[in-house]
């Protein structure tokens, strides 16, 4: 497990890093997990890449960021924000959030403590 203790990364530094990395593979990976082969999610070609490949790409992107809980939280919040409007109902929002919470562990990172994923001003 990657782990850092103490100061958790300057906020502006994290914002810059999250802006720089490509979070699309993470978004696709989670959507594949909750949607499977459902046809209605046609914004991505879900069948073009296996979920395990997307997960690895996602982890590789997250690995480009500074190893802090703060930056990981910011990345998860950004993923939630990016996908919020695509989530069609409350159940889907909860499913997406559950998968998002599992993402750090899947990538062998420490989950960010105190990370509030309800960041979309009530939209999600």
């Amino acid at each position: 497990m990657r782990r850092e203790r103490g100061r958790q990364g300057d906020s502006s530094s994290c914002e810059r890093q999250v802006d720089r990395v490509n979070l699309k593979p993470c978004e696709q990976h989670i959507m594949q997990r909750i949607m499977g082969e459902q046809e209605q999610y046609d914004s991505y070609d879900i069948r073009s890449t296996r979920s395990s490949d997307q997960q690895q790409r996602c982890c590789d992107e997250l690995n480009e960021m500074e190893n802090t809980q703060r930056c990981m939280c910011e990345a998860l919040q950004q993923i939630m924000e990016n996908q919020c409007d695509r989530l069609q109902d409350r159940q889907m929002v909860q499913q997406f959030k559950r998968e998002l919470m599992n993402l750090p562990q899947q990538c062998n990172f420490r989950a960010p403590q105190r990370c509030d994923l309800d960041v979309s001003g009530g939209r999600c």
Epitope: R5, Q8, Q69, A111, R114
Partner: antibody, heavy 123, light 110 residues
Framework: EVQLVESGGGLVQPGGSLRLSCAAS????????MTWIRQAPGKGLEWVAN????????DYLDSVRGRFTISRDNAKSSLYLQMNSLRAEDTAVYYC????????????????WGQGTLVTVSS | QSVLTQPPSVSAAPGQKVTISCSGT????????VSWYQQLPGTAPKLLIF???KRPSGIPDRFSGSKSGSSATLGITGLQTGDEADYFC???????????FGGGTKLTVL
């Protein structure tokens, strides 16, 4: 019933030391973060320090880091705050609190508080 | 001076509604959960709201919490004279690795 009882406060000269204790009962102490919070006379609340369930992680207010040490004894359901190099600005009521912080996607919150113990730093 | 900004005082008549704001930044309220506390004169504080919107058992639904961006709000409806107290918000600050409290708001029920 959850109970937190602080002790160890008193009058101490600047530069002196005190050790606060908090005896907890009514819940499984070893499964909760614990926190010290203080309140100077007539002022607001100020967080002092957190300690994780197993004592492996501690966080401190900048102005007390290096002078104060938070610790716990899960076998005795007790929380401690060792305060060294005390200053006049450390004068306050010190509260022992149970912190509800649990998993990664929850926050710090203080759902049970002791009655507080007064620490006065004065010459 | 507190990093979390609250109005020093608010007032309203019995039965009315009041809101207390708590303003922070992206490194604290913007990314972390907010809790609210009531401190009656001469007593220890009591938890009213945790994780932005949740109420502990025993806290009436007259008390509510919300959060948007880097600000949080405590709402109290059906004001009672017994609600006269100091109210504090709190959250974690990821940059400071510390819990922050607001400066407190004194509620007066007219």
């Amino acid at each position: 019933e959850v109970q937190l009882v602080e002790s160890g406060g008193g009058l101490v000269q600047p530069g002196g030391s005190l050790r606060l204790s908090c005896a907890a009962s009514g819940f499984k102490f070893s499964t909760f973060y614990m926190t010290w919070i203080r309140q100077a006379p007539g002022k607001g609340l100020e967080w002092v320090a957190n300690i994780k369930q197993d004592g492996s992680e501690k966080d401190y207010l900048d102005s007390v880091r290096g002078r104060f040490t938070i610790s716990r004894d899960n076998a005795k359901s007790s929380l401690y705050l060792q305060m060294n190099s005390l200053r006049a600005e450390d004068t306050a009521v010190y509260y022992c609190t149970r912190n509800g912080l649990q998993d990664s996607y929850s926050g710090d919150f203080f759902d049970h508080w002791g009655q507080g113990t007064l620490v006065t730093v004065s010459s | 001076q507190s990093v979390l900004t609250q109005p020093p005082s608010v007032s309203a008549a019995p039965g009315q509604k009041v809101t207390i704001s708590c303003s922070g930044t992206g490194s604290n309220i913007g990314h972390n959960y907010v809790s609210w506390y009531q401190q009656l004169p001469g007593t220890a504080p009591k938890l009213l709201i945790f994780d932005n919107t949740k109420r502990p058992s025993g806290i009436p639904d007259r008390f509510s919490g919300s959060k948007s961006g880097s600000s949080a709000t405590l709402g109290i409806t059906g004001l009672q004279t017994g609600d006269e107290a100091d109210y504090f918000c709190a959250t974690w600050d990821a940059d400071l690795s510390a819990v922050l409290f607001g400066g407190g708001t004194k509620l007066t029920v007219l």
